[in-house]
Amino acid sequence: MAQGTLIRVTPEQPTHAVCVLGTLTQLDVCSSAPEDCTSFSVNTSPGVVVDIAHSPPAKKKSTGSSTWPLDPGVEVTLTMKAASGSTGDQKVQISYHGPKTPPVKALLYLTGVEISLSADITRTGKVKPTRAVEDKRTWTWGPCGQGAILLVNCDRDNPESSAMDCEDDEVLDSKDLKDMSLMTLSTKTPQDFFTRHTLVLHVARSEMDKVRVFQATRGRLSSRCRVVLGPKQPSHYLMVPGGKHNMDFYVEALAFPDTNFPGLITLTVSMLDTSKLELPEAVVFQDSVVFRVAPWIMTPNTQPPQEVYVCSIFENEDFLKSVTALAMQARCKLTICPEEENMDDQWMQDEMEIGYIQAPHKTLPVVFDSPRNRGLKEFPIKRVMGPDFGYVTRGPQTGGVSGLDSFGNLEVSPPVTVGDKEYPLGRILFGDSCYPSSDSREMHQALQDFLSAQQVQAPVKLYSDWLTVGHVDEFLSFVPAPDRKGFRLLLASPRSCYKLFQEQQNEGHGDALLFQGIKKKNQQKIKNILSNTTLREHNSFVERCIDWNRELLKRELGLAESDIIDIPQLFKLKEFSKAEAFFPNMVNMLVLGKHLGIPKPFGPIINGRCCLEEKVCSLLEPLGLHCTFINDFYTYHIRHGEVHCGTNVRRKPFSFKWWNMVP
């Protein structure tokens, strides 16, 4: 039960006090007791329950004619059963007894009131009235946890607007309200109670820029809302009528969890005694609700796809046709960003990452806009954000970014268990340098901080600075699987490619050509590739880099070798010893459920079939996956990217609720 106030009683004159239902109020009977009195007894109205404990011994008696010694070891507490119909309608009489004097009486007139701030602390999607209880002041994780949840109102329900809904202090319509969390103030008081008392709703100054609270005012024609708390306003006096009354508030978060904001927001209602005009108002009671701002959550390749994004650029019609066909097979919506909007920037994966936010009453997809800001920089804000589609960005918006700040360098694993630690929403993966140096690249600290602060997908730093482009999607991917952990990790593997080519040469296919059918490209015989010692040395280095990540992923995701599939792939080291794919990088694939869009490798044709395609199919088809090889050579591969780099996917949110996990 929540702590109420301390009431001091005195025989000199009657004491008037307010007692809030659900609170435990302490009664000080000793400090003003007559000097020659040694004990006391208590009588109460039926609506008051008094508890007396004497320590030592710590024994309890219920009230009656019993007398209790007047010493510091006595604790008197009271609670009220119901709200008062009129001011002071409940009475407590303290009788002080002494050996030589008649009893001296002290009177306490109590007004019982119900004042409670309620929100969906049980996370059912409904607000249930809660009396003042301690638990509302804490937010706990896990299936038995409690505490309310706020969404950052980061969508744009008004198509005419260019701003997010949380950037204005208006409520557009009932759709906008659904992005907010309901909070109800319930009051039950005597009719004249608020002539001598006031309620103030408030938020800590340190949190005022993270939240906005609207009060619903029920008009005859429509339900209108006005701002009562927000970035410019940490407190608001409430006009509350006496009697039984419910007041609704709609709460929106304005900021995601981040370095200096753990995501918790406490809203408090304080009851003030304003009956003494010449004295400052005194706090009589406080009730609080703690909200946690819902984190931004990424979705792995194992989640069902819902929408595919791709750019239309000069001469990529065939690529578009292939992606369109794949999206149709996977029953996905397809969104094509036209040339005039992408400004010749085809790298859809690098510009944004689509995740979601979730409260018990609402789930919202949210696009995380990378700070790379090239030709596609307007696409997330102008074309993706919209009604029920949120937006967030981090990092410097002008300069100061590296290639590792693009979101081809941001992936997430499927759900995993590592030892006895569960990651039911998977773990975020991003690439970094292996140590900082004058020219090393790393993901901007603001992005790293944001990702870590979400708490529910603990990030893992991989090593990707060895690549020309430097993105994790150049050497890894995940595909769904019907067995084991429900997925496989795919890793690019030079060792596997050399093994395959050696086998082909041993079978007499040493003259088979890589890059056959590619115009203006030096075709390479298998035997020449195998005998090129420089290329072998380069791939030995690449293998070491990938193996480093392999061990890191096994450790951090709790994987066994049998959870990993090696995809044959060669690389070459270019300027500044940075690696890029020697032939189209097959691991850089588009995963749409069981349908995979894999870069066509243009490997050696043996017995009428590309031996690289054949090998990959033999590895993936037993998992029930369908491989489609997409020609991206001229439009993507030679520009240092592949199918995954050129596409993006919105996926179905997890059925697992983030608040049920324990980070």
Epitope: K521, N532, L535, L573, K574, E575, I638
Partner: antibody
Framework: QVQLVESGGGLVKPGGSLRLSCAAS????????VSWIRQAPGKGLEWVSF????????YYADSVRGRFTISRDNAKNSVYLQMNSLRAEDTAVYYC?????????????????????WGRGTLVTVSS | QSALTQPRSVSGSPGQSVTISCTGT?????????VSWYQQHPGKAPKLIIY???ERPSGVPDRFSGSKSGNTASLTISGLQAEDEADYYC???????????FGGGTKLTVL
């Protein structure tokens, strides 16, 4: 063959800033590595900065790191050198140079380390 | 002072051969095959004449040749001609924090 023209040089006070541009014609600059090289009056060549064709990494000489920023806008067929906190010793003719990033190369050709096309240069004078 | 060391000047008569040396360390010239040479006439931009130690861009006469031994690279110009009079700079990739180094330049005088 690509042709390069530098612009943006001029007189600036110590501590000031300048932005040099290198505009390409005759070819698409997105296929080229680009470096900035400078030459102080009567002195030798000094390599300043590099950006790769894919626009994914940059390198700087110790003498300018943290003050200069190289960037490229492939849509405008240009590369830029933003120079901040300029010092008297930054006075020089600044050359933009490039080398083609040939995807046909089977192994590292070293094209990022040599400059086969040069502009005529633009003079930057840092003086109070 | 420059990171790669070249002689300040060399000279030769028309028809003769001259060699310009470029000495570095095991972290640049000695480590990489990415040594290049540039010719610069007064008031003009430099011009690439040798790359990757010994390769010649198209249009550069075969009188110009490059080589490397240990930490030292060399440029040899045979059959000297009057128009060869210019400044010559060597350059190398380096594993230091400045990844491309130049020599201080050598003034070639054709007598």
């Amino acid at each position: 063959q690509v042709q390069l023209v530098e612009s943006g040089g001029g007189l600036v006070k110590p501590g000031g800033s300048l932005r040099l541009s290198c505009a390409a014609s005759g070819s698409t600059l997105s296929d080229y590595f680009v470096s900035w090289i400078r030459q102080a009056p009567g002195k030798g060549l000094e390599w300043v900065s590099f950006i790769n064709a894919a626009n994914t990494f940059t390198y700087y000489a110790d003498s300018v790191r943290g003050r200069f920023t190289i960037s490229r806008d492939n849509a405008k067929n240009s590369v830029y050198l933003q120079m901040n906190s300029l010092r008297a010793e930054d006075t020089a003719v600044y050359y933009c140079s490039s080398a083609n990033d040939d995807v046909d190369d089977i192994v590292a050709p070293g094209r990022g380390y040599y400059m086969d096309v040069w502009g005529r240069g633009t003079l930057v004078t840092v003086s109070s | 002072q420059s990171a790669l060391t070249q002689p300040r000047s060399v000279s030769g008569s028309p028809g003769q051969s001259v060699t310009i040396s470029c000495t570095g360390t095991s972290g640049d010239v000695g480590r990489y095959s990415h040594v290049s040479w540039y010719q610069q006439h007064p008031g003009k931009a430099p011009k690439l004449i040798i790359y990757n130690v010994y390769e010649r861009p198209s249009g550069v006469p075969d009188r110009f040749s490059g080589s490397k031994s240990g930490n030292t690279a060399s440029l040899t110009i045979s059959g000297l001609q009057a128009e060869d009079e210019a400044d010559y700079y060597c350059s190398s990739h380096s594993r230091s924090s400045t990844p491309v180094l130049f020599g201080g330049g050598t003034k070639l005088t054709v007598l």
